[in-house]
């Protein structure tokens, strides 16, 4: 048994290859430092997509070159993944770690299946 992390089962990326979903965690007490990691599971391989550590009350900050952005509100994190293509379709798992105060506490969501459909190229037009 570990911290419960909830996330939607399915999300469809938009035509620009952007997908957003909410990752919500349930923990008693008040954590002040939280790390959120997005993992992608495909073909039994798990890879880290992005990660951010934030102090409660502050903004969620990913690395400058990250494909993820996000905002936090209480025990809820709104995650956005950009630049997705059809080949990026897969299960995106939200992992939440309470880093401070101790003890360390971790929870992993069941994952959000993100479907990405590459847009059809626009046909040439005379207009």
């Amino acid at each position: 048994k570990a911290m419960h992390v909830a996330q939607p089962a399915v999300v469809l990326a938009n035509s620009r290859g952007t997908a957003s979903f909410v990752c919500e965690y349930a923990s008693p007490g008040k954590a002040t430092e939280v790390r959120v990691t997005v993992l992608r599971q495909a073909d039994s391989q798990v890879t880290e997509v992005c990660a951010a550590t934030y102090m409660m009350g502050n903004e969620l900050t990913f690395l400058d070159d990250s494909i993820c952005t996000g905002t936090s509100s209480g025990n809820q994190v709104n995650l956005t993944i950009q630049g997705l293509r059809a080949m990026d379709t897969g299960l995106y798992i939200c992992k939440v770690e309470l880093m401070y105060p101790p003890p360390y506490y971790m929870g992993i969501g069941n994952g959000t299946q993100i479907y990405v459909i590459d847009p059809e190229p626009c046909p040439d037009s005379d207009f």
Partner: antibody, heavy 114, light 108 residues
Amino acid sequence: EVQLVESGGGLVQPGRSLRLSCRGSNFNFDDLAISWVRQAPGKGLEWLGFVRSKAYGETTDYVASVKGRFTISRDDSKFIAWLQMDSLKTDDTAVYYCTTFNYWGQGTLVTVSS
Amino acid sequence: QPVLTQPPSVSVAPGKTARISCGGNNIASEAVHWYQKKPGQAPVLVIYYDSDRPSGIPERFSGSNSGNTATLRISRVDAGDEADYYCQVWDRTTDQPVFGGGTKLTVL
């Protein structure tokens, strides 16, 4: 296997100093605050202080009874933390543990006696 | 700073359920953690965040927290459970941990 191992305990005279070391392995040492907790003979657990992680600038905090006498520091590149104890008193005699609260070392005995 | 009050001792017959309380003003608003301490051994985290068990801790250990009392329950107690048990919370005002005084569990 996660490990925290303390060393440096022993017999020391009142007023003298002692430095305890705590070496961590097989966990995210640099992400977590490292605390020192002691247990004097026949007494309960007493938190002494901690050094926070680099995300918090490795800042420290101490219980009032040891503030100014004890200093905690860390070197994440070596996976090690220290407890520097100065001006030791006889009632500092205890087993000293380093801990992340999830994980605890086996403890090292410090005896302050003349 | 919160004061956590534990009974100095609790006795229980083998196979029965031991209940160890930890009292504190509105403790339900805090995350409570429990540690087992055997003589000559390091403390072990047995329950954290009120009711969760770290890996390796038997299901016989459970916790709850409501109102002004958190409780550690140990079902089907055996002689190996004899130890001192400490509750702990994090004081958000001082940003420091606080331990209860400890409870000695004796298996009759």
